[in-house]
Interface confidence: low
Amino acid sequence: DAHKSEVAHRFKDLGEENFKALVLIAFAQYLQQCPFEDHVKLVNEVTEFAKTCVADESAENCDKSLHTLFGDKLCTVATLRETYGEMADCCAKQEPERNECFLQHKDDNPNLPRLVRPEVDVMCTAFHDNEETFLKKYLYEIARRHPYFYAPELLFFAKRYKAAFTECCQAADKAACLLPKLDELRDEGKASSAKQRLKCASLQKFGERAFKAWAVARLSQRFPKAEFAEVSKLVTDLTKVHTECCHGDLLECADDRADLAKYICENQDSISSKLKECCEKPLLEKSHCIAEVENDEMPADLPSLAADFVESKDVCKNYAEAKDVFLGMFLYEYARRHPDYSVVLLLRLAKTYETTLEKCCAAADPHECYAKVFDEFKPLVEEPQNLIKQNCELFEQLGEYKFQNALLVRYTKKVPQVSTPTLVEVSRNLGKVGSKCCKHPEAKRMPCAEDYLSVVLNQLCVLHEKTPVSDRVTKCCTESLVNRRPCFSALEVDETYVPKEFNAETFTFHADICTLSEKERQIKKQTALVELVKHKPKATKEQLKAVMDDFAAFVEKCCKADDKETCFAEEGKKLVAASQAALGL
């Protein structure tokens, strides 16, 4: 339904607080280097303008699109060219090209200082002194570092962030109360950002059809009692929400997400029996809860899939009449019966089924041709099952840190051209699949593991796209969204790689390593491990293990020494020499 003033419409729907927060997120995700104060000023100007439009929708400029209004506002930033370079050229374009241009300049790895958490007392004082600014700063800092963060979900995180400070700054032991909550928000936030980044990549790189297929599979697993028409309606609405958020249309996205939550709760009887608790919560919690809700129980006595999709004489007729609807029904029926499969596996099965029908429905005897199509599924199902079994065994044997190290070596040998920080970050995240998923029973392992790996490998893909260095990574990332993980799994050692020159500086350590947290110390050691493999890609596991054990002993020894810096200097030289000898460098 058309509104005379889109900005007034969204302001009224969302309310001033959410409107301001979402505009701040939008601006921070576009102009990631701008100071906080500049963004607050822009947001206040947009808000004041929106209020004039609420008062009189016919007022000057109130009929302009949100992209036009926001883009014009962003283009008033005086330092645009010196701060962002060619992004300033976007301002010479007209909508919708201008917004597309801004989107293309979003940076997944912006050059921003690492967020350092201050003392609890500092944070509590800041929170009490100016709660509004403190919370805005949180939105700003997260949004600029995660330019695809799902905006309505970030409002939910901010609400929890505020609740944590409200509660803990009054507690007897503020730190004991607050720090675990902040750790949890940080970890959940990183996971949420990565999951949303995959959704946006799916839409932007592979198109709406790919995203809709993913949504059909996931929602069918989650709501197996809902009928196909209901799932299709939810998929259409969900696709609109994510298309808007990924496109920077955050006000529309948040508004439509609220409408979708309302619809789901009004129709929960025909969707899922698991929604009752979610639907009693306030809006932000409700939407989050629905997105995370557990799978409903499968209906009893579901008939065999073969009847409609293999044995029926109408298979090719039904397929020809409405290909995507028929394939959607196949995906829906298969997914609701298989909560034990990963979404990407279900999509591979649907793709195999589609390819078979394309070939067979043009054959002399279609039925004879596609009669054994379900047999083709067996190896596709067994491949991830076997991989997960092997890797969970390895994880249980090694523990998380050493399992990460095994993956670091594996992936550095596959794609040694990728930057060391990216290899460390991605391999550490890949390694977390162990503690995240291996504890689950068989029936939950694959959806947990393979869908999580899809999220992590997408991080590799988006980081690599910014600075492409490996044809093999580009190939695995771009050929097929659902086959990314099998593509990376199938990569062997890159025989074309010319080993990196040895540089002693890379393996020089100082006393500051002793004061690092366990996690940061692990990252330092894992960085050294990647560099070792880049110098000596043919090194055996045993050689690398020996060097890493020596390295750990060296760090432990020097951190206990009275003169730490001298120990690191002298013992470090010996370690480098011994490592070179051990690896034949």
Partner: nanobody
Framework: DVQLVESGGGVVQPGGSLRLSCAAS????????MGWFRQAPGKEREFVAA????????YYADSVKGRFTISRDNSKNTVYLQLNSLRPEDTALYYC?????????????????WGQGTLVTVSS
């Protein structure tokens, strides 16, 4: 308002040392996070080090870790930066900064008050 005055800059040879001081007046010093930033000719201002109110936390830029040490004496309303193993690339105007409420120590926009700077030149 808080006034900050830096001192201790000068010319030093590579490998040499200096100790910078920053004296604060006009506020309750012990309630401020204190930071040092620097700006080399033709470059942007960059974070060097910071220290929390009660010296519980210190933070350093990667480029100075292990060489520079930040400390404070709340009884003297002074923050110090000890510069060791100086290199030519450390040449810059060093600024002291104070922040009443900071979320992120390393960001210059978080700091409310700034000194005029003291020049450090590392040259042979």
């Amino acid at each position: 308002d808080v006034q900050l005055v830096e001192s201790g800059g000068g010319v030093v040879q590579p490998g040499g040392s200096l100790r910078l001081s920053c004296a604060a007046s006009g506020g309750t010093f012990s309630t401020y996070v204190m930071g040092w930033f620097r700006q080399a000719p033709g470059k942007e201002r960059e974070f060097v080090a910071a220290i929390s109110q009660n010296s519980i936390h210190t933070y350093y830029a990667d480029s100075v870790k292990g060489r520079f040490t930040i400390s404070r004496d709340n009884s003297k309303n002074t923050v110090y930066l000890q510069l060791n193993s100086l290199r030519p690339e450390d040449t810059a105007l060093y600024y002291c900064a104070a922040s009443r409420f900071t979320s992120w120590y390393t960001a210059d926009y978080e700091y409310d008050y700034w000194g005029q700077g003291t020049l450090v030149t590392v040259s042979s």
